[in-house]
Amino acid sequence: FEIALPRESNITVLIKLGTPTLLAKPCYIVISKRHITMLSIKSGERIVFTFSCQSPENHFVIEIQKNIDCMSGPCPFGEVQLQPSTSLLPTLNRTFIWDVKAHKSIGLELQFSIPRLRQIGPGESCPDGVTHSISGRIDATVVRIGTFCSNGTVSRIKMQEGVKMALHLPWFHPRNVSGFSIANRSSIKRLCIIESVFEGEGSATLMSANYPEGFPEDELMTWQFVVPAHLRASVSFLNFNLSNCERKEERVEYYIPGSTTNPEVFKLEDKQPGNMAGNFNLSLQGCDQDAQSPGILRLQFQVLVQHPQNESNKIYVVDLSNERAMSLTIEPRPVKQSRKFVPGCFVCLESRTCSSNLTLTSGSKHKISFLCDDLTRLWMNVEKTISCTDHRYCQRKSYSLQVPSDILHLPVELHDFSWKLLVPKDRLSLVLVPAQKLQQHTHEKPCNTSFSYLVASAIPSQDLYFGSFCPGGSIKQIQVKQNISVTLRTFAPSFQQEASRQGLTVSFIPYFKEEGVFTVTPDTKSKVYLRTPNWDRGLPSLTSVSWNISVPRDQVACLTFFKERSGVVCQTGRAFMIIQEQRTRAEEIFSLDEDVLPKPSFHHHSFWVNISNCSPTSGKQLDLLFSVTLTPRTVDLT
């Protein structure tokens, strides 16, 4: 290789070792018989050299720095050339550096031809390996404006007092032009101005100077956004920190065309403006920081440019063509009415008919879109009926109660998914078997999952709510006499992540007379809390419920009731509880309207708890809460 640098070119070429690799064999630059690992070539020098290995690009990098002095003479403005031409350089990873020094009063503008630049944050890299690192100067201090890739929106960067631009090209990249030019401008009276041009819809992520380190004290940085008039821009702050200000206040200022209150001043913690039409400017203003504890000001934000919301073109497909007896409603979630103006929030069918709520029915494929500034203002409620009309056909048949993935993929939170399970009267009953054992929600042990199953009777005349159940408990199955509704209710957006934990199978089984039977297989680790259905309203008249409680061979179960008396007063009939050992059939019967509830009792084998209600007088209802705790057996009593 031969590199010859013209005199007065102010170019220095440096070939040096790159980041060390785990290559076994070292490689050297060979020049007049010497093997060296660093070669520096200055203006006016001509040097011939070779490499001692076949793939020097795995070992060495080359830096070409051109110093441009605009202090002592005229500045060479215009398109910047790659000198020396890349074809004359060894095929190493190359960094071209232009260091422009200018007076404080002179503005310098870097203009980037297409493709424009896209800023990247710490730890990110450019797909093609081509990076632009741009820094400015405040007196003697270097300020990093940012690192940029190709294919973005940044078209111009204006600075004053000097600029350092480093263009990094991988050894295999064919690029032979700098892709930018330098122009002089009048003083910009701030650290820098970054111009970002949107041709159509898109987004740009931008950062304050020195990000993720602190923005220079009491400085001003401006971003100018060029947005077509038919599009709308929204700003959101992805990450920011505030420093400790002694004087002035850190803030962002917007200059929004058509606004009567320009500049509009926002705190960094405020919700930033959205739906802006056309061009706008955003400026970040620092403050005088506390010398003892300055903290740091930094900002990373995103500008999203899209068609106005009434032209929103994001289509969601909801395929209900294979479903039967199902309806899906998207509607506003209840909120306290405020007097403040709230933009409309609509859901549209086929992008044409828009309304504040929409019901989709089974049997077809639906295309929907949203016109809404905040989709958390909406939620979804779904109802599906699974019915059996012919008991001979249905018996032992099973159905999976799961939210279809099409529904989970919608950008609106699911509130309720209800399955109405209908059986022929006095012919069949139902059994619910969860994928994961269930816990009954009680005050003593509330559910803290992102969803629960609400199980209630679906017979219009019957007011029977079996309870709220969530995954992670000891209830292995729930058998119910007749029609019920099972509602999966979500409580947190994290349901999307926990959706895999949902899973309930319903089977049609031979008819039985009790209103409900809970099969409980307690874990040794925790106390199981169980309560009678219709808690707070009381077990309905003449209703009977049972719990089948399994006790492992090596354990003993402690059954504890949480009050002394049941509190029920019977108008007609008797209320009673039977505790029956399953192995010996031995049973204890307690009159709930007369007797004291049993003290904690120990059971070495599986047992039943059956509670049957009378017709109570109003206000004296039957509500019972009890717990089962397993402990290891100390003495074998068998």
């Epitope: 020049i31 007049s32 018989k33 010497r34 093997h35 060296i36 660093m38 070669l39 520096s40």
Partner: antibody, heavy 119, light 111 residues
Framework: EVQLQESGPGILQPSQTLSLTCSFS??????????VSWIRKPSGKGLEWLAH???????RYNPSLKSRLTISKDTSSNQVFLMITSVDTADTATYYC???????????WGQGTTLTVSS | KIVLTQSPASLAVSLRQRATISCRAS??????????MHWYQQKPGQPPKLLIY???NLESGVPARFSGSGSRTDFTLTIDPVEADDAATYYC?????????FGGGTKLEIK
């Protein structure tokens, strides 16, 4: 492990020819960049570089002695040789051979062989 | 030819103090961003031993008490702190240009 060992006659009379051999191990003179130099140190004086031979058989000599010096190598037997013609008493010194792995500094030296020129 | 002048010719330094040896070249020994100046230590009856290569690089196995600095024509070898075992003669050597030359040597005594 790199080792160099010089050998020579020990005593010569003026006008005779000095033949020195440097036998080495732990490296090869066919490796790119590798070279061996001869350096001497007269008693009570400083070090003086005499000659160098590179891996590609290129040779360099100290101009003040060039007409009397010949350096050569036998790559296969890992040896470098130096001949100095017409020795006189000023050539009395300890002669060292030293390895130069990258064409400049000497990282390994032999223990040296002493030459006395006396009539 | 490039003449290397070492100073002082000899110096005596107390244990655990700093010793500084200078080497001045009659012309620059720098080429292509490298300084082709090296330092050796020689004890009586032993061959020289490489301490520092290319002005400032410490040869492996040499204690970090030894350091080198300088460029173009002025170079310095520093030993800090000096230990009893450092009593020896120190030579600078250049090979930026033929003929390769050594300095006259600096004899270090430990007080």
């Amino acid at each position: 492990e790199v080792q160099l060992q010089e050998s020579g006659p020990g005593i010569l009379q003026p006008s005779q020819t000095l033949s020195l051999t440097c036998s080495f191990s732990g490296f090869s003179l066919s490796t790119s960049g590798m070279g061996v130099s001869w350096i001497r140190k007269p008693s009570g004086k400083g070090l003086e570089w005499l000659a160098h031979i590179f891996w590609d058989d290129d040779k360099r000599y100290n101009p003040s002695l060039k007409s009397r010096l010949t350096i050569s190598k036998d790559t296969s037997s890992n040896q470098v040789f130096l001949m100095i013609t017409s020795v006189d008493t000023a050539d009395t010194a300890t002669y060292y051979c030293a390895r130069s792995p990258y064409g400049d500094y000497f990282d390994y030296w032999g223990q040296g062989t002493t030459l006395t020129v006396s009539s | 030819k490039i003449v290397l002048t070492q100073s002082p010719a000899s110096l005596a330094v107390s244990l655990r103090q700093r010793a500084t040896i200078s080497c001045r070249a009659s012309e620059s020994v720098d080429s292509y961003g490298n300084s082709f100046m090296h330092w050796y230590q020689q004890k009586p009856g032993q061959p020289p031993k490489l301490l520092i290569y290319r002005a400032s690089n410490l040869e492996s196995g040499v204690p970090a008490r030894f350091s080198g600095s300088g460029s173009r024509t002025d170079f310095t070898l520093t030993i800090d702190p000096v230990e009893a075992d450092d009593a020896a003669t120190y030579y600078c050597q250049q090979n930026n240009e033929d003929p390769w030359t050594f300095g006259g040597g600096t004899k270090l005594e430990i007080k």
